[in-house]
Amino acid sequence: SAGAGSHCQKTSLRVNFEDIGWDSWIIAPKEYEAYECKGGCFFPLADDVTPTKHAIVQTLVHLKFPTKVGKACCVPTKLSPISVLYKDDMGVPTLKYHYEGMSVAECGCR
Amino acid sequence: NAKGNYCKRTPLYIDFKEIGWDSWIIAPPGYEAYECRGVCNYPLAEHLTPTKHAIIQALVHLKNSQKASKACCVPTKLEPISILYLDKGVVTYKFKYEGMAVSECGCR
């Protein structure tokens, strides 16, 4: 697993809709793989974490003055949709093939 | 106070000399980059433009902090700055050098 010592990467995060109270409106699936971005954004920032210029600058400052600024953060930079069967405002079961922004596709340093 | 520690943009002045970039950036000598600081606690405020994934992660963290970490306060919109720099030894002016300063922070 990706602990604080490891580099920014995508790790598994199974989300059960009942656990977060979303089973009241999401009929299916019961759970899904949301993934999570974990790990540190260490200098030098690798190309695969697609750092912005600001993230590079922040990382350089953190390297020289750790108390002045925090490290860049490992976050989702690209999300994927999942398919859900849910109850709409009228309580009618509705299938949404592409329910956007639910699962991590890529992680990066921001 | 929890509200004071909530995700927001804070000042961060960058001196190019301090990070060794004065070797290729001629002007300005530095700039206000800003930084995103603070926590992303549930419920995530609208102005932090949380993604569905960030909301779900915040909820999972709320239920079981061991299972998932909080969403992170990061730049969601960046702005350019103007720079005069050396490009292969040739002095070049770039009116819009993109992605250098934070204009908005959010929870991701």
């Epitope: - | 002007a27 700055i81 103007s82 005069l84 002095v91 070049t92 002016y93 300063a101």
Partner: antibody, heavy 115, light 107 residues
């Protein structure tokens, strides 16, 4: 439309401090750079310093440490402060927007240093 | 600092003539040179930016060229309103520096 307007005194006493405000409209100080240029009577243009859009500042070392440039982005104002004025500081002082070249200039403020 | 040497200091011409104004930098400034027109009583007016780019609304009789150290402003068909002072500016190094100016006058 884009406008820059300098406001400041016409007359400043020898050794005193000059303060000029450049108020801009039609553009943002976080997008464009604003520089200060002066022209003494019968002489050429002289660059004084720059307030860059990112908040960085450059000064012409010819003014040593007499010059100070600052801004208030929320009020769309850039400030020039120069102390220990001498008679050869008598000039027309301009603020100008720098994007691709100095494309917009203020009307300038003529400052006379008197003893 | 980069010294910008403008030549000639003054130039006599006739309406309809073609004139060339020169500017020489003491060190290479790439293409970072502008040309300005300064009419007494008015604020300076940008003609050319980045050595050769005509500013919006500037008549096409004004042409800029050059790279490195040598730059020129050409006015292909002088009109009465062009009889004024021209300055070059380099922004390839700090401090930015202007040339001393070229005064264009009628013969």
């Amino acid at each position: 439309q884009v406008q820059l307007k300098e406001t400041g005194p016409d007359l400043v006493q020898l050794t005193q401090t000059l303060s000029i405000t450049c108020t801009v409209s039609g553009f943002s100080l976080s997008t464009y750079n604003v520089h200060w240029v002066r022209q003494p009577p019968g002489k050429g243009l002289e660059w004084m310093g720059a307030m860059w859009n990112g908040g960085g500042i450059n000064y012409n070392s010819a003014f040593k440490s007499r010059l100070s440039i600052s801004r208030d982005t929320s009020k769309s104002q850039v400030f020039l402060k120069m102390n220990s004025l001498q008679t050869d500081d008598t000039a027309k002082y301009f603020c100008a927007r720098f994007g691709y070249g100095f494309d917009y200039w203020g009307q300038g403020v003529m400052v006379t240093v008197s003893s | 600092e980069t010294v910008m040497t403008q030549s000639p200091t003054s130039m006599s011409t006739s309406i309809g003539e073609r004139v060339t104004l020169n500017c020489k930098a003491s060190q290479s400034v790439g293409i970072n040179v502008d040309w300005y027109q300064r009419t007494p009583g008015q604020s300076p007016k940008l003609l050319i930016h980045g050595a050769s780019n005509r500013h919006t609304g500037v008549p096409d009789r004004f042409t800029g060229s050059g790279f490195g150290r040598d730059f020129t402003l050409t006015i292909s068909n002088v009109e009465a309103e062009d009889l004024t002072i021209y300055y070059c500016l380099q922004y390839g190094s700090i401090p930015l520096t202007f040339g001393a100016g070229t005064k264009l006058e009628l013969i």
